[in-house]
Amino acid sequence: MDSFNYTTPDYGHYDDKDTLDLNTPVDKTSNTLRVPDILALVIFAVVFLVGVLGNALVVWVTAFEAKRTINAIWFLNLAVADFLSCLALPILFTSIVQHHHWPFGGAACSILPSLILLNMYASILLLATISADRFLLVFKPIWCQNFRGAGLAWIACAVAWGLALLLTIPSFLYRVVREEYFPPKVLCGVDYSHDKRRERAVAIVRLVLGFLWPLLTLTICYTFILLRTWSRRATRSTKTLKVVVAVVASFFIFWLPYQVTGIMMSFLEPSSPTFLLLKKLDSLCVSFAYINCCINPIIYVVAGQGFQGRLRKSLPSLLRNVLTEESVVRESKSFTRSTVDTMAQKTQAV
């Protein structure tokens, strides 16, 4: 289920709105959008507004701190991934409004719907990196004191982005535009050229690498972290841990429908009633996955309010408090300083 039209959506044939010609073919079906598409449009609109403003604010807050604070590097990269995906939303929105007509050309068809998958892979790889960082802070504090620096964090982010780009290539390569119907409309979708095995392989890889494997490893990771944190009866703030757990949980919640329907569609017969039903829900599942692109700033604000008692501070300072928990990183390759000075305190400040 590769973003928009996994296969051709059966939206029938509809009028060429720009021409007032009595000979123009009349729509055989209704010009009104289906309920799942209307819901998708509403979600897209909200995600775009919240996602662009929220992530822009997060980028602005964390960009200044990224040189000094490792947490800021993590949240900055997550926000950039979400912000990039949100930029595609007006075009995807326009396509649904036009009954999935794609007037933006072949290059845009390959790139824009693939952005959500790039976001998926970038987000989960960055979350895995952040989780590894959390794990090391708890279980390898001395190693962290010596090696946990901004340089290494940026390298880890670069690796995550590189892998995300590589994993998005199949989606990018198989996306094509084609024309159908009277009067003709352009459709943007995936075409595996009659290779069902390739289609299934892409769906399985996406499910395993983008969902199941991260779900398993991150669940184990946070189980250990939380057990250690609780066993130490940490009295210090665990806000970063809480925020990261919330971000990770939201990732899996909002990607679940997309992944389930995607794997089902790759194994179902295209003429089966289930396949046709899932195809109609495609846009809705994509829009639901897109909620990931705006949920993080909401989590940060909610977390900030929780930690502040109530919203006393301005939004930027509230976000700064949540996203930049650690203080100055010393300009040294071998030593970094965290918010706390002693190792015991450091362990509790996860």
Partner: antibody, heavy 118, light 111 residues
């Protein structure tokens, strides 16, 4: 590579039905439409109908009452059925793939020559 | 239905000669949604299936020689063969695909 192979009877009695199967390879029916066109002896090309990639159909208004096009995605087959054939339905019947762009037929079947006679 | 009118119905040519044939539609084939003209040209040789030459009125199908050029917009279209070769002797059909599909009666190119 892309291929469309047609199979069907060479002769049909008047008032009977004509059934032709178009078996495709090298592409998927869920990503491409298939058109049906006929050519009467010494005459030009006449479009009959199309089955789109989503399974919906459009027919030439002159044949809408006696023509049906369907498909089986798993077998990569498109089925053409025309009822109540008359002598003037004698023609070569073609199936053709709708190309990606321009609603143009980029690959054609070899044609099925059909004679309507008693 | 849209009616397609081709002219001339037949054309006697010599090898190397430049040839032009016309196709007119009863209504505009231009889609304001896609900004394209939905007219295609096909070549059919005796005993063979038709072959796509041009779509979108002027876009040459891959593998089609450069001597074939399509032009026109709206209701008037032209197929030009810059230098006719013996293998070009065939019947040429125009076809609209804007509102259902309609073929022209064809132009026969002969020596």
């Amino acid at each position: 590579q892309v291929q469309l192979k047609q199979s069907g009877p060479g002769q049909v009695a008047p008032s009977q039905s004509l059934s032709i199967t178009c078996t495709v390879s090298g592409f998927s029916l869920i990503n491409s439409a298939v058109h049906w066109v006929r050519q009467s002896p010494g005459k030009g090309l006449e479009w009959l109908g199309v089955i789109w990639s989503d399974g919906s159909t459009d027919y030439n208004t002159a044949f809408i009452s006696r023509l049906s096009i369907s498909r089986d995605n798993s077998k990569s087959q498109v089925f053409f059925k025309m009822r109540s054939l008359q002598v003037d339905d004698t023609a070569v019947y073609y199936c053709a793939r709708n190309g990606r762009l321009g609603n143009a037929m980029d690959y054609w079947g070899q044609g099925t020559s059909v004679t309507v006679s008693s | 239905d849209i009616v397609m009118t081709q002219s001339p119905s037949s054309l006697a040519v010599s090898v190397g000669e430049k040839v032009t044939m016309s196709c007119k539609s009863s209504q505009s084939l231009f889609s304001s949604r896609t900004r394209k003209n939905y007219l295609a040209w096909y070549q059919q040789k005796p005993g063979q299936s038709p072959k796509l030459l041009i779509y979108w009125a002027s876009t040459r199908e891959s593998g089609v020689p450069y001597r074939f050029t399509g032009s026109g917009s709206g209701t008037d279209f032209t197929l030009t063969i810059s230098s006719v070769q013996t293998e070009d002797l065939a019947v040429y059909y125009c076809k609209q695909s804007y509102n259902l599909l309609t073929f022209g009666a064809g132009t026969k190119l002969e020596l």
